[in-house]
């Protein structure tokens, strides 16, 4: 559930403290509610970033268990289409620490409306 | 050339247990994800588990979820699987197999062992 | 569960010819980031699987390329342009965009 996927970002931010990525990620700091899983996309593609540039199993491992996460507890809830949404790419750069608790704001938009 | 070795199949009775191993080599095993995937006889193919490459993560279906375990030694580049509280059902020839990841190009098991026959009678 | 139907399940073709298979899934296997983790295995006899395709269409190193891939959403389809006696085996889809993942019943392919 989306608890669980607030522990792996919990997790992921302090897997990175611990290293050095300086990289500047699209970020959705004013998620609209009828945008909210196109938003999650643009998080998600972001995060196998941080994924890559870190070369680190353990960031590897839990951005992977994350994606699994959310692909399930969305896909119970059958196919939402999404219009009028921003592209990942029109979205502001971030540096990471202020990516994630973006993600965490989300998140919990996700916990709030189940 | 990526080789696994999958063991430890045999006969065990209805309620009984079993561990099997695969033993992987010439390729960095701590690297990938790994699977089980078993084969009734004369049947298809289920998914059985998948375990992250780190062995924090693991996955598998309600066919076999709270009875079986999915785990590994990346020191000993080998996966296991301890099969508990064995049905009739279970009865199949397990393979483990490799299993690449997003960041190498996409989701698939590209590599698969020889499989071991587990056979669950009384 | 997505479940994954094949058709057909039993499939004879002369030597030469092409041949066809089609997976259907029970729901769409477009993952949230927009990929598709479809892939095709053979099962030749007596033998393990062995992977073909991935991702819907990519060939897997050292699969032939009269093999391919194509479909999208939930119809899938692996084509042979032309079936060498070495094709003769059991051909499986897989979906591992959703747990739990899911092998298709299986086509069984023979020399006619």
């Known amino acids: 559930n989306w608890v669980n996927v607030i522990s792996d970002l919990k997790k992921i931010e302090d897997l990175i403290q611990s290293m050095h990525i300086d990289a500047t990620l699209y970020t959705e700091s004013d998620v609209h509610p009828s945008c909210k899983v196109t938003a999650m996309k643009c998080f998600l593609l972001e995060l196998q970033v941080i994924s890559h540039e870190s070369g680190d199993t353990d960031i590897h491992d839990t951005v992977e268990n994350l994606i699994i996460l959310a692909n399930n507890i969305l896909s119970s809830n059958g196919n939402i289409t999404e219009s009028g949404c921003k592209e990942c790419e029109e979205l502001e750069e971030k540096n990471i620490k202020e990516f994630l608790q973006s993600f965490v704001h989300i998140v919990q938009m996700f916990i709030n409306t189940s | 050339e990526v080789r696994l070795m999958a063991s430890g199949g045999g006969l065990v009775q209805p309620g009984g247990s079993l561990r099997l191993s695969c033993a992987a080599s010439?390729?960095?095993?701590?690297?990938?994800?790994m699977s089980w995937v078993r084969q009734a006889p004369g049947k298809g193919l289920e998914w059985v588990a998948t375990?992250?490459?780190?062995?924090?993560?693991?996955y598998y279906p309600e066919s076999v979820k709270g009875r079986f375990t999915i785990s590994r030694d990346n020191s000993k580049n080998t996966l296991y699987l301890q099969m508990n509280s064995l049905r009739a059902e279970d009865t199949a020839v397990y393979y483990c197999a490799r299993r690449v990841s997003f960041i190498t190009g996409g989701w698939a098991m590209d590599y698969w062992g020889q499989g071991t026959l587990v056979t669950v009678s009384s | 569960d997505v479940v994954m139907t094949q058709s057909p399940l039993s499939l004879p073709v002369t030597l030469g010819q092409p041949a066809s298979i089609s997976c259907r899934s029970s729901q769409s296997i477009v993952d949230i980031t927009g990929n598709t983790y479809l892939e095709w295995y053979q099962q030749r006899p007596g033998q393990s699987p062995r992977l073909l395709i991935y991702?819907?269409?990519n060939r897997f190193s050292g699969v032939p390329d009269r093999f391919s891939g194509s479909g999208s959403g939930t119809d899938f389809t692996l084509k042979i342009s032309r079936v060498e006696a070495e094709d003769v085996g059991v051909y499986y889809c897989f979906q591992d965009s959703f747990v739990p993942y899911t092998f298709g019943q299986g086509t069984k392919l023979e020399i006619k």
């Open positions: 991702k819907v269409f």
């Open positions: 010439e390729f960095t095993f701590s690297n990938y994800a």
């Open positions: 375990i992250s490459r780190g062995g924090d993560y693991t």
